[in-house]
Interface confidence: medium
């Protein structure tokens, strides 16, 4: 017998559906409308056919109070093909749920999505999360999705993009975005993120993370930070194979002098890097390749320095520097 | 831990009125929402009003007797009830979502207070 491919936790709080077969019973999904979090997972099916069943275009006020009455507040689709229609047509009918957070992975989207009707209302997200979503629309696939959002958007996480970049004249400012993820974009480099990162479109990002996007000098993502007016209070560049050294060519570049936590962890760093912001609340240099206690005048004045995980570290060793939050402990790096 | 407390029910004859306050304290990052759900005896929960990005939403029911508030500066919001009716009675719930905490600026968050009892004699 094949198992059931919904499962309702006990609290009614969180509902999987994986739907394997290649005809689904997507009724089954019906025992999710209790819960709050609610994952899908297609199995990679193409949803195409699902358009004749559906009218994409009905209006969706006449499911207003039906959605209205849902529980969930956090939503995640996977593993399909879903025609751009269709997906437009889900978030019309979820701009009157309560939902907070969707996640869309692993996802190929055909089609282009049509202009938002002047009558309809934008879905009121305080998170949206993609990971390794394809678009046929290319780099203006964020406009196209902006439109069908309310501006209220709070965190943009952008992970495994096939287009990382995006066509900033046709995005509108995100006024309410505080956290800016773009992790998980190897490939993105800091020439990337400064097509990524819109001038005058993120005016209130507090988090950046760029974890794993291929990030080679602090310097140069100030420098992209800078042409883009981007001016975060914390940001994370670990798991980026950095480099300590600058350029002598490169011109110098001015921190904002917001930025109070910086990552460095687990970047390969032999040496603390040079043209790092002149005072810090947080520094994270652990696991990396320190061979020696950083000097004082190495480092930016920092209140929380981390330096766990370093060759020179061992356990049980006095603390490199004043204020440092170390354990003793050799994390696992 | 982020925690929610809310203060102000009671006892209060029908037409009477109530200020309910619930204050976010823990390691916070970004309010979204703030909002009062009730919940009557041997029913379910119920959004009452809200504050989301921007607007306010009130349930039919409470429409023009109940306001909601926010102070930003004390990440406290205020639910001011007039002409109370004995169908008010319930207990009310502080609701807020956090997109993330100083720990965790990534994520979104829904934290729910105790309760505080609100009811109305006729």
């Known amino acids: 017998t094949t198992p059931e491919p919904c499962e309702l936790d006990d609290e009614d709080f969180r509902c999987v559906c994986n739907f394997s077969e290649p005809q689904p019973d997507w009724s089954e999904a019906f025992q999710c409308v209790s819960a709050v979090e609610v994952e899908i997972h297609a199995g990679g099916l193409n949803l195409e056919p699902f358009l004749k069943r559906v009218d994409a275009d009905a209006d969706p006020r006449q499911y207003a109070d039906t959605v209205k009455a849902l529980r969930v507040r956090r939503l995640t689709v996977g593993a399909a093909q879903v025609p751009a229609q269709l997906l437009v047509g889900a978030l019309r009918v979820l701009a009157y749920s309560r939902l907070k957070e969707l996640t869309l992975e692993d996802l190929k989207i055909t089609g282009t999505m049509p202009p938002l009707p002047l009558e309809a209302t934008g879905l009121a997200l305080s998170s949206l999360r993609l990971r390794n979503v394809s678009w046929a629309t290319g780099r203006s696939w964020l406009a196209e999705l902006q439109q069908w959002l309310k501006p209220g958007l709070k965190v943009l996480s952008i992970a495994q993009a096939h287009s990382p970049a995006f066509s900033c004249e046709q995005v509108r400012a995100f006024p309410a975005l505080t956290s800016l993820d773009l992790s998980d974009n190897p490939g993105l480099g800091e020439r990337g993120l400064m097509a990524a990162l819109c001038p005058h479109k993120f005016p209130a990002i507090q988090n950046l993370a760029l974890r794993n996007t291929g990030m080679e000098t602090p310097t140069g993502v100030c420098a992209a930070l800078a042409a883009a007016g981007v001016q975060p209070h914390s940001l994370d560049l670990s798991h980026n194979s950095l480099r300590a050294t600058v350029n002598p060519s490169a011109p110098r570049c001015m921190w904002s002098s917001a930025l109070n936590s910086l990552n460095l962890s687990f970047a390969g760093l032999e040496q603390v890097p040079k043209g790092l912001p002149a005072k810090l609340r947080v520094l994270d240099l652990s696991c990396n390749r320190l061979n020696r206690a950083p000097q004082p005048d190495e480092l930016p004045e920092v209140d929380n320095l981390t330096l766990d995980g370093n060759p020179f570290l061992v356990p049980g060793t006095a603390l490199p520097h004043e204020g440092s939050m170390n354990s003793g402990v050799v994390p696992a790096c | 831990q982020v925690q929610l407390q809310e203060s102000g029910g009671g006892l209060v004859q029908s037409g009477g009125s109530l200020r309910l306050s619930c204050a976010v304290s823990?390691?916070?990052?970004?309010?979204?929402?703030m909002g009062w759900y009730r919940q009557a005896p041997g029913k379910g929960r119920e959004l009452v009003a809200e504050?989301?990005?921007?607007?306010?939403n009130y349930a039919d029911s409470v429409l023009g007797r109940f306001t909601i508030s926010r102070d930003n500066a004390k990440n406290t919001v205020y639910l001011q009830m007039n002409s109370l009716k004995p169908e008010d009675t319930a207990v009310y719930y502080c609701?807020?979502?956090?997109?993330?905490?100083?720990?965790?600026?990534?994520?979104?968050?829904?934290?729910w207070g105790q309760g505080t009892q609100v009811t109305v004699s006729s």
């Open positions: 504050l989301s990005y921007g607007s306010t």
């Open positions: 609701n807020a979502d956090l997109t993330g905490t100083s720990w965790s600026p990534y994520r979104y968050l829904e934290v």
């Open positions: 823990g390691s916070i990052f970004s309010i979204v929402d």
